[in-house]
Amino acid sequence: EPTMYGEILSPNYPQAYPSEVEKSWDIEVPEGYGIHLYFTHLDIELSENCAYDSVQIISGDTEEGRLCGQRSSNNPHSPIVEEFQVPYNKLQVIFKSDFSNEERFTGFAAYYVATDINECTDFVDVPCSHFCNNFIGGYFCSCPPEYFLHDDMKNCGVNCSGDVFTALIGEIASPNYPKPYPENSRCEYQIRLEKGFQVVVTLRREDFDVEAADSAGNCLDSLVFVAGDRQFGPYCGHGFPGPLNIETKSNALDIIFQTDLTGQKKGWKLRYHGDPMPCPKEITANSVWEPAKAKYVFRDVVQITCLDGFEVVEGRVGATSFYSTCQSNGKWSNSKLKCQPVDCGIPESIENGKVEDPESTLFGSVIRYTCEEPYYYMENGGGGEYHCAGNGSWVNEVLGPELPKCVPVCGVPREPFEEKQRIIGGSDADIKNFPWQVFFDNPWAGGALINEYWVLTAAHVVEGNREPTMYVGSTSVQTSRLAKSKMLTPEHVFIHPGWKLLEVPEGRTNFDNDIALVRLKDPVKMGPTVSPICLPGTSSDYNLMDGDLGLISGWGRTEKRDRAVRLKAARLPVAPLRKCKEVKVEKPTADAEAYVFTPNMICAGGEKGMDSCKGDSGGAFAVQDPNDKTKFYAAGLVSWGPQCGTYGLYTRVKNYVDWIMKTMQENSTPRED
């Protein structure tokens, strides 16, 4: 317990102190006082440095004194032989004696009193930063006007913190500017603007004078700017050393001004303003921005339009433009949206053709369609090359998005017909010589394939059977062979409207307009043994002249047998119609004059006994195309004749081309169109 005074006596005082003793006294007076220790008697064995016996005075870690020997007072009016004064409120006194004393020593007597200390003057370190005021038992610090005492009750500072600036423009200066700023202060200013605005600080060099850095480059007084995780500074020295315009990229800025005890200068003054937060001027790849600006700032909205061939995709849908807003955080909204190449997808397949697997289906990619050659060709032109267009479609320069159409090549036999072995007016033939040849089994007759869906034949062949069974692709019409050939199923039979239907067809003498079309249920697949014959053109090039040669083929009657099993063919010249008129009808069913001859009929034959006969009806009279020698067209159809082995009459197909085209057009499926 602290006391204001007290007495200390060596052991056994005033008797001699014992040997080998160590005793200590802890003196404590109240806080704010020092200790004055007075020795009134001292009689301790003397030794060098008081090594044997001694009284030691210790203050904290410091030895204030060590006494031994004998002392007497120099002042007759005072008993004090030694005194100590310390400005602290604690003191320790230690007495030690060794194992022997050569004489009898009586020790020491002392007392202490608590004395007031002047904290303002008694210490090397001044306790107050500004004014120190001593009083008995303590002191207090005080400050000049406009300063305040910090919580440590020792340091004075100016009240320069806690200001929050929210206006979009403002000015801030150090305390007392331009007079010297206060020492030993920490000033904090906060700028807090609306989100979307960045604080921009502007300083002039001449508006800044802060105590310069030490030799190590450390600022003794400093100005620091803190914006989020970015720091500008510390700055110090004569004239502002930093950038005169500081764009903080933040709506919140803390300004911290720290000063030490010395070296006050005039300080600093700055201006700040809020700039709308800028957004980067990065253009989304493959796009254009509207409006175009040199700088985009908070709340600016741009329309981003993808370039042709690019789109923004989300799930299964896409868009070519979107809006983006410069946001309060300095970033664009919708920055995830990217203009990516349009994907045209896997190209559609086409009938009788193919498209190679594309390396890419993205904008600008190119694909090529081809037809199954040599049996099909591209009818609607365009070359088959398509590119992936900006609208996501595969587009051809000629056809646009329309797909190419592979249609059968007409009139080209895989093997040309050669008359090798003479067989009474004709030769054996192979179906590859006449791939357009169609076999009708009831009645036994022929026809000509003119495209995937249509067979051309004579009207008299189908007038009695509107659901004929037809076959293609076989040279032999033996039952076993037909089973392996392609059977065609009719959908509808179209007989020319000018063909007169009779009650008794056997008595017919008028074969005018002997032409019919059979529409098939399913398309015919073309190949080496099945392909169509061309139709005649409408120009005068396709007008037949006497002597023009044509080929006939069929499984009709020969000189040896009523029906042929294998295909026969012959090459015949066109003859004047009168030649046919002059031949006597073999088995007339009426008067010879009753037989009708019209310009819709072609007369051909008369050479070497080559002629068509019963069972060949409806087959084509194939003539080489005058404009393309590789092709044959159906100039005629086997119709009737006065006598086998002489001249025969053929329906003149050229006169019916309009009817054929109209009938096919009006009865086509959407797929064919």
Epitope: V312, A319, Y323, S333, N334, L337
Partner: antibody, heavy 116, light 107 residues
Framework: QVQLVQSGAEVKKPGASVKVSCKAS????????MHWVRQAPEQGLEWMGW????????IYAQKFQGRVTITADTSTNTAYMELSSLRSEDTAVYYC?????????WGQGTLVTVSS | DIQMTQSPKSLSASVGDRVTITCRAS??????LDWYQQKPGQSPKLLIY???YRYSGVPSRFSGSGSGTDFTLTISSLQPEDFATYYC?????????FGQGTKLEIK
Amino acid sequence: QVQLVQSGAEVKKPGASVKVSCKASGFNIKEYYMHWVRQAPEQGLEWMGWIDPENADTIYAQKFQGRVTITADTSTNTAYMELSSLRSEDTAVYYCARSRLFFAYWGQGTLVTVSS
Amino acid sequence: DIQMTQSPKSLSASVGDRVTITCRASQDVRTALDWYQQKPGQSPKLLIYSASYRYSGVPSRFSGSGSGTDFTLTISSLQPEDFATYYCQQQYTTPYTFGQGTKLEIK
């Protein structure tokens, strides 16, 4: 297929906080924005804010600024919405939704009831 | 913030009717407007995006039009499953605001 599954209903006292989760499957949330929209009983839809899970950028509606925190955990493909200092008027169904061009997919909703 | 105002607030109609809902923005939102359908107890479903584009799987009887500040959602021939609440939403700039909704009821 794309799915957003939200955490279950919550009952909270005024002043408390609530954290709703939204687990995504069938897509990577880093490739989209994740939004939060709420709907008070018999009321309309109210947009609260969004997060870009790729970089944790967030934008909040001014009304919720300071009370709402939207976060995302890309490792679990989950977005979160935390609303603090709850009041009775915060009683609503909270929806998460994903977007690039539009809000094509929505969670099933989480009912948060604030009652003393 | 951009305010979105829908009209009417509610509307009664019969199956087969042609129905039009309008949405007005307090400022120009170009074509950054979407329409959503919400049935009781369900999450909203996207119908129309960018003012006039039908979202995949949405029946062709739904169509959207408009740009700037005035927009329209049209249902050409109402079906029983169309009775619901419809919301417009602008995605022109944040905050992405919704209209207050239009409740379509059976007459």
